[in-house]
Interface confidence: medium
């Protein structure tokens, strides 16, 4: 039938170790009030509870100071094992990274996981991408149909640890040359070669066509 307290005639059982630091204490339920600066911690075991007065709160709890009595309060931060205050975690549960008093399954953008401490540390900070450069090939901006254009970004802040890699700082993509033919009519030898090959192919195709027409006419006449 609930938890009926049997109050003692004495205010405190000094001999009882559970009454250490208590202002009022009972044999069955321990402390109900603590001395200043100590934290009241109410242990519950099934349907029974007893109070303790502690200098510091156990793991998973933080010290909450209040005008009437300081007490230990449970960490309510998700995936947190121990905390400094109601909303500041100091140690996360296994598999979670600590970042600014919170616990994350992966570090936020701009931060990298440090496996040895399970914390998110400042990653390699890079600046914004530059505009795409001029489309070129073999350092030329003409004379080809396709080329490559490149853009870059700077490392603004180096990572805290050398083991943390920086993201790519240069990237290229295929682009169409604005001038396929270079001004002044000069063409690269390669381009000339390509043109000759194309001409030759067209001549062969035309000859094959004419030969087919000839054969068809010949058969019709027979």
């Amino acid at each position: 039938q609930g938890n009926r307290w049997r109050r003692s005639k004495r205010a405190s059982y000094v001999s009882n170790p559970i009454c250490k630091g208590c202002l009022s204490c009972s044999k069955d339920n321990g402390c109900s009030r603590c001395q200043q600066k100590l934290f009241f911690f109410l242990r519950r075991e099934g349907m029974r509870q007893y109070g303790e007065c502690l200098h510091s709160c156990p793991s998973g709890y933080y010290g909450h100071r209040a005008p009437d009595m300081n007490r230990c309060a449970r960490c309510r931060i998700e995936n947190c094992d121990s905390c400094f205050s109601k909303d500041f975690c100091t140690k996360c549960k296994v598999g979670f990274y600590l970042h600014r008093g919170r616990c994350f399954d992966e570090c936020p953008d701009g931060f990298a996981p440090l496996e040895e401490t399970m914390e998110c540390v400042e990653g390699c900070e890079v600046g914004h991408w530059s505009e795409w450069g001029t489309c070129s090939r073999n350092n030329r901006t003409c004379g080809f149909k396709w080329g490559l254009e490149t853009r870059t970004r700077q490392i603004v802040k180096k990572p805290v640890k050398d083991t943390i890699l920086c993201p790519t700082i240069a990237e290229s993509r295929r682009c169409k040359m604005t001038m396929r033919h270079c001004p002044g009519g000069k063409r690269t030898p390669k381009a000339k070669e390509k043109r000759n090959k194309k001409k030759k192919r067209k001549l062969i195709e035309r000859a094959q066509e004419q030969h087919s027409v000839f054969l068809a006419t010949d058969r019709a006449n027979q």
Epitope: G2, N3, W5, H64
Partner: antibody, heavy 125, light 107 residues
Framework: EVKLVESGGGLVKPGGSLKFSCAAS????????MSWVRQTPEKRLEWVAS???????YYPDSVKGRFTISRDNVRNILYLQMSSLRSEDTAMYFC???????????????????WGQGTSVTVSS | DIVMTQSHKFMSTSVGDRVSITCKAS??????VAWYQQKPGQSPKLLIY???TRHTGVPDRFTNSGSGTDYTLTISSVQAEDLALYYC?????????FGGGTKLEIK
């Protein structure tokens, strides 16, 4: 925003059974203890049941053996199964976050910080 | 079981007044007392827990004092919207128990 929505109340005969639910949203349901509290027609509040985040259940003697609290942490739903109902079980039943007797003291786990709008149960022949 | 007694079923006050609602526990509950407000047609709302900690969004005109067995909820300057039923609850020992409630009426 924490939201608790009860459903499934109604009129039931003495000795009968009823199961109702409470859909929770806006918080990490599986991390919190949940409770059922009822309000009698005379406006008295009575604690009915609590379930810890780990699934341990607690009841007052008045409902022990007749009522069963359970939870579905995947669907974020709290349930109350009531059987062998009596006329004194007639009340508005509220689902509330908190009220965990199984943990050590803390911020909200003992006090009930958010309540649903309630579902009415009438036990009458 | 711990019995929580709210001696006043009704209290009448005027807007701007200071009002105190009392609650007495049948034994020392180590400040593990919560106060709830229930407005007409609504569900209860937590105001204060652990005797002195205001819940999120609760105006600072609501305060609680007391220790051991005696606790008092004080509204420093009553507003029209404070018209409600007020309940105390001990969250020290199971079964959790509530006071019978005090209905605050505005003159």
């Amino acid at each position: 925003e924490v939201k608790l929505v009860e459903s499934g109340g109604g009129l039931v005969k003495p000795g009968g059974s009823l199961k109702f639910s409470c859909a929770a949203s806006g918080f990490s349901f599986s991390s919190y203890a949940m409770s059922w509290v009822r309000q009698t027609p005379e406006k008295r509040l009575e604690w009915v049941a609590s379930i810890s985040s780990g699934g341990s259940t607690y009841y007052p003697d008045s409902v022990k053996g007749r009522f069963t609290i359970s939870r579905d942490n995947v669907r974020n739903i709290l349930y109350l199964q009531m059987s062998s109902l009596r006329s004194e079980d007639t009340a508005m039943y509220f689902c509330a976050r908190g009220g965990d007797p199984g943990v050590y003291n803390g911020d909200y786990e003992d006090a009930m910080d958010y309540w649903g709008q309630g579902t009415s149960v009438t036990v009458s022949s | 079981d711990i019995v929580m007694t709210q001696s006043h079923k009704f209290m009448s006050t005027s807007v701007g007044d200071r009002v105190s609602i009392t609650c007495k526990a049948s034994q020392d509950v180590s400040s593990a007392v919560a106060w709830y407000q229930q407005k007409p047609g609504q569900s209860p709302k937590l105001l204060i827990y652990w005797a002195s900690t205001r819940h999120t969004g609760v105006p600072d005109r609501f305060t609680n004092s007391g220790s051991g067995t005696d606790y008092t909820l004080t509204i420093s300057s009553v507003q029209a919207e404070d018209l409600a039923l007020y309940y105390c609850q001990q969250h020290y020992s199971t079964p959790w128990t509530f006071g019978g409630g005090t209905k605050l009426e505005i003159k």
